[in-house]
């Protein structure tokens, strides 16, 4: 069975084809090759002789037991080598020779028992080494690590490391890898020698499900003393053994670390006193809780010095009381409990993401809701009912505003966005908005992107609501049940590049409304009911137009519409997916491609 | 289409068939078997995925006695610092995991429940597997 040609001459997918040897009928130009799940078993010298251009090679689950010297020799362009799930028993010292550009080596679940004997010391370009799910017992980083000066990610998770000693990290003292991210999750740790991490600098350290008791966790965290880490991730996994007890003593040792960003990811435990618990983390710049349950929501009004707070997938009794002077970014997404938004006091806030919480807002939006006048980014998407009762008073700095898939009320009663002259991006898609007021977008003089798919218009008619949006470059009006539009609806949009009118109820096509769109490049009219043209004579679309989508419409392939069908043929170079432009009527021509039709109509004399 | 039996409990019988053409082997055990009136137990899965499990989600299509419920999307793995350790599993890596579950107080009417589970993962998104579970429910009391 042949391999699947994904990208001709470049990418080949040969997964699970029962190959016992490397295929010899693929082009020399192959760059990406997936040979996973084939019983190759043995890689001899110059196994990839015929693949001089190879950049990505996937050998997952190939039952490889032996890799000989020079197996990858001559793959000087290879950047990614994946060996996941091979029961390697014999790995020659020169197994990885010739890989002078290798950046990513994945040797997950390969029976690797030690880093010491892993022959990768010459791979100077290596950025990512993943040796998770192996049998490694010692965390001693071998001397050859001093050659791996580009290493950024080392994944040692799911191994058998129990202890970390001062001597294990000696090589990092000799050559501080300022950018190294280290994942030690799911190792059964019970001892970290104090001083082992002293004066070590890491970009990220992840320790999840490492400790089987609170005491072990406490002493191991104390053993991290002296570590300087940009991002520390602690926590557990839902499907692994969890701590039975967790209290403030667990994290006391963090006072002896220098931490820029902290994240606690999943804890099967109710956090009741976060002030005491995170006492050592009051001055980290970014603080993040993922999948934890928080009892006392008032604690977030304590004087923490955080600049970024992230609460994701957490459970709350009610919406938390947030009063944080220094906070610039708040991400509060996919949380449960506390369905009603209550005012927060965050005077420095510039970025606020409150998406996917099922929240309802009795009144939106003004500076009093968020306690800030500095807000530039506001995401309230995928929430409940949001009643628009204020026109963003004090929030004039806003540049990005997203309401998609929330239920907006009172949107057509006044110019809601009147004061948002700095707004660049607005998404009100699928918000149950019914446009009945022409001034709905007044004030948005800087707006570049407007997404309003899935809403509706009075009498299914698009009026002149865009007159002030002179900088608009992207407009999505899809799924709005539109049947007609004002001939001057788009007259002021001279910068518009993309217009999506798909999935509406237009029965005819007219070029007149687009005559002023001098920058228009993409026009999508797919999934309408277009049968013919509005006027007998269709003009040309703007000369800037490059893509016109008329697929999945109801073309009437009859003589009375001959001029329209001819006009469509004349637009051939603009049309996309022409094979999906089919006749709907008459019945004998149903399903026939419009462009292949040859309609010869006799003129009645 | 071969049917794979999972388990029987006092009020339910659970089995599944594959609804994709690949039919990559997957081993599913429930201990103790689910009782629909209330249940607490462990779900054990042994599986070797054909793609990374990063950003795994399930599309669930549930039918109750021939009545189709709306499609549900259940996100399991968001993509970073996920709740489940198997979210970091790579293509070809053994997934051997036990997940605890519990529910109570749901009243199910007697009949045949079908649940098509489409597992989607990776970037670009592709189907990982598709299983159709059939639960025959005979409540002792309702």
């Amino acid at each position: 069975e042949p391999c699947v040609e994904v990208v001709p001459n470049i990418t080949y997918q040969c997964m699970e084809l029962n190959f016992y040897k490397i295929p010899d009928n693929l082009p020399f130009s192959t760059k990406n090759l997936d040979l996973s799940f084939n019983p190759l078993r043995h890689l001899g010298s110059y196994s990839f002789f015929s693949f001089p251009e190879l950049q990505v090679l996937d050998l997952s689950r190939c039952e490889i037991q032996t890799i000989e010297d020079g197996a990858y020799q001559s793959l000087s362009h290879l950047s990614t080598l994946i060996l996941t799930g091979n029961p390697i028993q014999s790995l020659a010292l020169g197994a990885f020779s010739g890989l002078s550009s290798l950046q990513k080596l994945v040797a997950v679940e390969t029976n690797l028992a030690s880093l010491e004997n892993f022959p990768i010391g010459h791979l100077k370009t290596l950025k990512e080494l993943n040796v998770a799910h192996n049998l490694i017992q010692s965390f001693k980083l071998p001397e050859y690590f001093s050659n791996l000066t580009n290493l950024e990610h080392l994944d040692l998770s799911s191994n058998k490391i129990q202890s970390i000693y001062c001597t294990d990290l000696r090589v990092l003292h000799q050559m501080p890898l300022l950018n190294l991210s280290l994942d030690l999750s799911l190792n059964p740790m019970n001892f970290i020698q104090p001083g082992a991490f002293k004066e070590i600098r890491l970009h990220k350290l992840t320790l999840r499900n490492n400790f089987d008791s609170l005491n072990v966790m406490k002493t191991c965290i104390q053993g991290l003393a002296g570590l300087e880490v940009h991002r520390l991730v602690l926590g557990e996994f839902r499907n692994e053994g969890n701590l039975e007890k967790f209290d403030k003593s667990a994290l006391e040792g963090l006072c002896n670390l220098t931490i820029e960003e902290f994240r606690l990811a999943y804890l099967d435990y109710y956090l009741d006193d976060i002030i005491d618990l995170f006492n050592c983390l009051t001055n980290v710049s970014s603080f993040s809780l993922v999948s934890v349950t928080i009892e006392r929501v008032k604690d977030f009004s304590y004087n923490f010095g955080w600049q970024h707070l992230e609460l994701v997938n957490c459970k709350f009794g009610q919406f938390p009381t947030l009063k944080l002077k220094s906070l610039k970014r708040l991400t509060f997404t996919s949380n449960k409990g506390g369905n009603a938004f209550s005012e927060v006091d965050l005077p420095s806030l510039e970025f606020l993401d409150l998406s996917r919480n099922g929240l309802s807002f009795k009144g939106c939006c003004s500076q009093s809701d968020f306690g800030t006048t500095s807000l530039k980014y506001l995401d309230l998407s995928f929430n409940g009912v949001i009643t628009m009762s204020s026109n963003f008073l004090g929030l004039e700095q806003l540049e990005h505003l997203d309401f998609q898939h929330s239920n907006l009320k009172q949107m057509s009663e006044f110019s809601v966005f009147l004061s948002l002259r700095n707004l660049i991006y607005l998404d009100i898609s699928h918000t149950h908005t019914r446009v009945a007021f022409n001034g709905i977008f007044n004030g948005l003089s800087s707006l570049e992107v407007l997404k309003m798919a899935g809403n509706s218009f009075q009498e299914n008619f698009l009026p002149d609501i865009f007159t002030e949006l002179r900088n608009l470059t992207f407009l999505d009006l899809s799924q709005c049940q539109l049947e007609q539009l004002s001939p001057t609806a788009f007259n002021s949009l001279s910068s518009l590049q993309v217009l999506n009118m798909s999935h509406n109820n237009f029965f005819s096509l007219d070029t007149f409304p687009y005559k002023c769109l001098n920058s228009l490049q993409v026009l999508d009219y797919s999934l309408n009911h277009i049968m013919t043209s509005k006027k007998q004579e269709l003009q040309h679309f703007p000369s800037s137009l490059a893509f016109l989508n008329l697929t999945q419409n109801d073309f009437a392939c009859t003589c009375e519409h001959q001029s329209f069908l001819q006009w469509i043929k004349d637009q051939r170079q603009l049309l996309v997916e022409v094979e999906r432009m089919e006749c709907a009527t008459p019945s004998d021509k149903q399903g026939m491609p419009v462009l292949s039709l040859n309609i010869t109509c006799q003129m009645n004399k | 289409q071969k049917q794979y039996w999972v388990c029987n409990s006092s009020d339910a019988s659970i089995s599944y068939t594959y609804c994709d053409k690949m039919q990559y082997p997957i081993s599913i055990n429930v201990n103790p078997c689910i009782e629909l009136k209330r249940s607490k137990g462990l779900l054990h899965i042994f599986y070797i995925p054909r793609r990374d499990l990063k950003q795994l989600y399930f599309n669930l299509y549930i039918t109750v006695n021939t009545m189709n419920l709306p499609k549900r999307k259940e996100v399991i793995c968001r993509g970073s610092d996920d709740d489940y350790s198997f979210c970091r599993a790579l293509k070809g890596e053994t997934v051997n995991t036990t997940i605890s579950f519990s529910f109570k107080g749901i009243k199910f009417s007697k009949g045949k429940y079908k649940c098509v589970v489409e597992a989607i993962s990776g970037s670009p998104e592709e189907m990982l597997f598709c299983l159709e579970f059939v639960i025959l429910h005979q409540p002792n009391s309702n």
Partner: nanobody
């Protein structure tokens, strides 16, 4: 078993030309691809050019594109490498190699090419 014998190496001035030959003998029917590799002192062996017997498709390393030409003479079971516009950085031992249907790779003993004024 396949035997390969190279010839044609030598000393040449920058800008000059050389033609290397590689004669194959033994189980030549099993050969899929043949090619030329080179190894400069202290460097890894690298691809120069490849040719596929079945369809005649050809590959050249970027460093030799437009200057070197690989060809074959089926009747004589010989592969040639015509090297024009030679540069000092082309100095290396040039090896002929053949890959069989069983994925085994056979090598010649190598021929020295020196480009120097």
């Amino acid at each position: 078993e396949v035997q390969l014998v190279e010839s044609g190496g030598g000393l040449v001035q920058p800008g000059g030309s050389l033609r290397l030959s590689c004669a194959a003998s033994g189980s030549i029917f099993s050969i899929n691809d043949m090619g030329w590799f080179r190894q400069a002192p202290g460097k890894e062996r690298e691809h120069v050019a490849l040719i596929r017997f079945k369809d005649g498709s050809i590959y050249y390393a970027d460093s030799v594109k437009g200057r070197f030409t690989i060809s074959r003479d089926n009747a004589k079971s010989t592969v040639y490498l015509q090297m024009n516009s030679l540069k000092p950085e082309d100095t290396a031992v040039y090896y002929c190699a053949a890959k069989t249907g069983t994925s085994f790779v056979y090598w010649g003993q190598g021929t020295q090419v020196t480009v120097s004024s």
